[in-house]
Interface confidence: medium
């Protein structure tokens, strides 16, 4: 998939917990796979610009060619620009690599907004600020694209970290992370800490506006506070999870939980917004509007067209509610909730007409492809993609933006019955649709 617009307190949470609150589990986590503790060399290895995705530096070929690569948990191809393009400062030059092998096979990936196509091959790949290994991986050399690369984004390729089932042209093309785990002793786990900017950025500041960490092979405990809570990966294609309840400032949306996962719910670092199915979006906006009714905003704001602006430094965060998503827990009938603040779902942007004010875009939007927990959600949390144990962990990020009154939260356990019923079963047809247009 591809970006659209398409990228340390009291909790202040209102409302009763869902059902019976269970006694708090011990803070001792069950043993994690892989190395634990400190991954100093990988901390702060992500860069990016608000709304344009987070990228990591990678090297490809022999001698190594350095490229910035978008980290995307919503797709499964490792694809890099391999021909001149007006938006690329550099690109992969296969003819200069002595280790490049042509697979004599093309790949074509259409998106709602654009496409890329290229030629498949393999080459040696490493991550300078990652594990000290080099692996031979599949690479799609992008020779032609339309509305894929973003002007000024500073990345030249995409690292799809999801599963082979959604790889193009088909699931026989092994994704990069599978190759990495197979060819090394690196545990089958990675974790992401995406750190949003939290304030509007002018052209100069935007050059190095957001950062974060991709920890390959384990968990770095310095990147989160509190404990990690895990939700099962429902199916290994996208990183699909199940949402069992949604609250706005503690008020339950009271929808059939199947609606929250219609037709799936995924965790996707390559999407900017929190995207919700139409019915859920409408209910959520109605509830957020009601909760923030001390100020009236134009309809165009809620629909993503207009910005809201306040005099610099006067954004009234307190009038906006928190959004809580309850995720299926690892234990039967147990769930936990992740709570984001307006500091996550109001995305700072520069008004094209004036730069005096602090302006924001409503970063919750409508989806026709299910719930997408994009950067808006991920910027509040340290997210662990524990592939080995088929689960995704959430903990409060040490770098999330908050104020003196509220902080993002991960809390549990809560008793929730019949959570399996919340998953939507997609009719068995050829699953060839690409999730796209990722605002």
């Amino acid at each position: 998939t591809h970006l659209g617009i398409r990228l340390p307190l009291r909790s202040g949470l209102a409302g009763p917990p869902l059902g019976l609150r269970l006694p708090r589990e011990t803070d001792e986590e069950s043993e994690e796979p892989g190395r634990r503790g400190s991954f100093v060399e990988m901390v702060d290895n992500l860069r990016g610009k608000s709304g344009q995705g987070y990228y990591v530096e990678m090297t490809v070929g022999s001698p190594p060619q350095t490229l910035n690569i978008l980290v995307d948990t919503g797709s499964s191809n490792f694809a890099v620009g391999a021909a001149p393009h007006p938006f690329l400062h550099r690109y992969y030059q296969r003819q200069l690599s002595s280790t490049y092998r042509d697979l004599r096979k093309g790949v074509y990936v259409p998106y709602t907004q654009g496409k890329w196509e290229g030629e498949l091959g393999t080459d040696l790949v490493s991550i300078p600020h990652g594990p000290n290994v080099t692996v031979r991986a599949n690479i799609a050399a992008i020779t032609e694209s339309d509305k894929f690369f973003i002007n000024g984004s500073n990345w030249e390729g995409i690292l799809g970290l999801a599963y082979a089932e959604i790889a193009r042209p088909d699931d026989s093309l092994e994704p990069f992370f599978d190759s990495l785990v197979k060819q090394t002793h690196i545990p089958n786990i990675f974790s992401l800490q995406l750190c949003g900017a939290g304030f509007p950025l002018n052209q100069t500041e935007a050059l190095a506006s957001v950062g974060g960490s991709m920890i390959i092979g384990g968990i770095d405990h310095s990147l989160y506070t509190g404990r990690l809570w895990y939700t099962p990966i429902r199916r290994e294609w996208y990183y699909e999870v199940i949402i069992v309840r949604v609250e706005i400032n503690g008020q339950d949306l009271k929808m059939d939980c199947k609606e929250y996962n219609y037709d799936k719910s995924i965790v996707d670092s390559g999407t900017t917004n929190l995207r919700l199915p139409k019915k859920v979006f409408e209910a959520a906006v109605k509830s957020i509007k009601a909760a923030s009714s001390t100020e009236k905003f134009p309809d165009g704001f809620w629909l993503g067209e207009q910005l809201v602006c306040w005099q610099a430094g006067t954004t009234p965060w307190n009038i906006f509610p928190v959004i809580s998503l309850y995720l299926m827990g690892e234990v039967t009938n147990q769930s936990f909730r992740i709570t984001i603040l307006p500091q996550q779902y109001l995305r700072p942007v520069e008004d094209v007409a004036t730069s005096q004010d602090d302006c924001y875009k409503f970063a919750v939007s409508q989806s026709s492809t299910g719930t997408v927990m994009g950067a808006v959600i991920m910027e509040g949390f340290y997210v662990v993609f524990d592939r080995a144990r088929k689960r995704i962990g959430f903990a409060v990020s040490a770098c999330h933006v908050h104020d003196e009154f509220r902080t993002a939260a991960v809390e549990g356990p809560f008793v929730t019955a019949d959570m399996e019923d919340c998953g939507y079963n997609i009719p068995q047809t050829d699953e060839s649709t690409l999730m796209t247009g990722r605002a």
Partner: antibody
């Protein structure tokens, strides 16, 4: 500089449909809204609806609900407005216009207009 | 829907004089209002947005004021190229984003 270029004039029979296109060039397409506004001869401006390509579904004025369909093709940066069950009072110049990226949803860039004549 | 009412329907002014156009909303739209100018055979052109901010390239003789339900467009010294029809549009609710009926500024 963003430009919106519309398709040419159309003459249609009552009861038929017309589809007008609006191609954007020179700027971002998908994250802005494209509105359609019509103007009957000697009359004022009438807002028909709009679409934010990246968010999908269009919004329509009640008056046109069920008769108008606004779509966008992001791959070609083109928006479309289709009006069905045409009647003589639909004779008008149809404009597309862009908004977005600011606190206000003002229509800052307009197409040149497409004259649609409905006549038997 | 919000109804926008413009007055007068026609304003006859001599070149060099001041023109004051009025726009009233049936309910408060805050400062979410724009003014457009349209000349015969041309597409409308944005003049003012946010009730009082001039669009890029619009001369200083055009100014907008007001908020809530009452708005005014003032042209301080009419030039020959300013004779046109002027429309206000509320940018607060949609659908629909309603326009006023227009004020025609003609040469006296």
């Amino acid at each position: 500089q963003v430009q919106l270029v519309q398709s040419g004039a159309e003459v249609k029979k009552p009861g038929s449909s017309v589809k007008v296109s609006c191609k954007a060039s020179g700027g971002t397409f998908s994250s802005y809204a494209i509105s359609w506004v019509r103007q009957a001869p000697g009359q004022g401006l009438e807002w028909m609806g709009n679409i934010i390509p990246i968010f999908g579904p269009a919004n329509y004025a009640q008056k046109f609900q069920g008769r108008v369909t606004i779509t966008a093709d992001e791959s070609t940066s083109t928006a479309y407005m289709e009006l069905s069950s045409l009647r003589s009072e639909d004779t008008a110049v149809y404009y597309c216009a862009r908004s977005g990226g600011t606190k206000y949803g003002m229509l800052d860039v307009w197409g040149q207009g497409t004259m649609v004549t409905v006549s038997s | 829907e919000i109804v926008m009412t413009q007055s007068p329907a026609t304003l006859s002014v001599s070149p060099g004089e001041r023109a004051t156009l009025s726009c009233r909303a049936s309910q408060s739209v805050g400062s979410n209002l724009a003014w457009y100018q349209q000349k015969p055979g041309q597409a409308p052109r944005l003049l003012i947005y946010g009730a009082s901010t001039r669009a890029t390239g619009i001369p200083a003789r055009f100014s907008g004021s007001g908020s809530g339900t009452e708005f005014t467009l003032t042209i301080s010294s009419l030039q020959s190229e300013d004779f046109a029809v002027y429309y206000c549009q509320q940018l607060y609710t949609w659908p629909p984003r309603t326009f006023g009926g227009g004020t025609k500024v003609e040469i006296k």
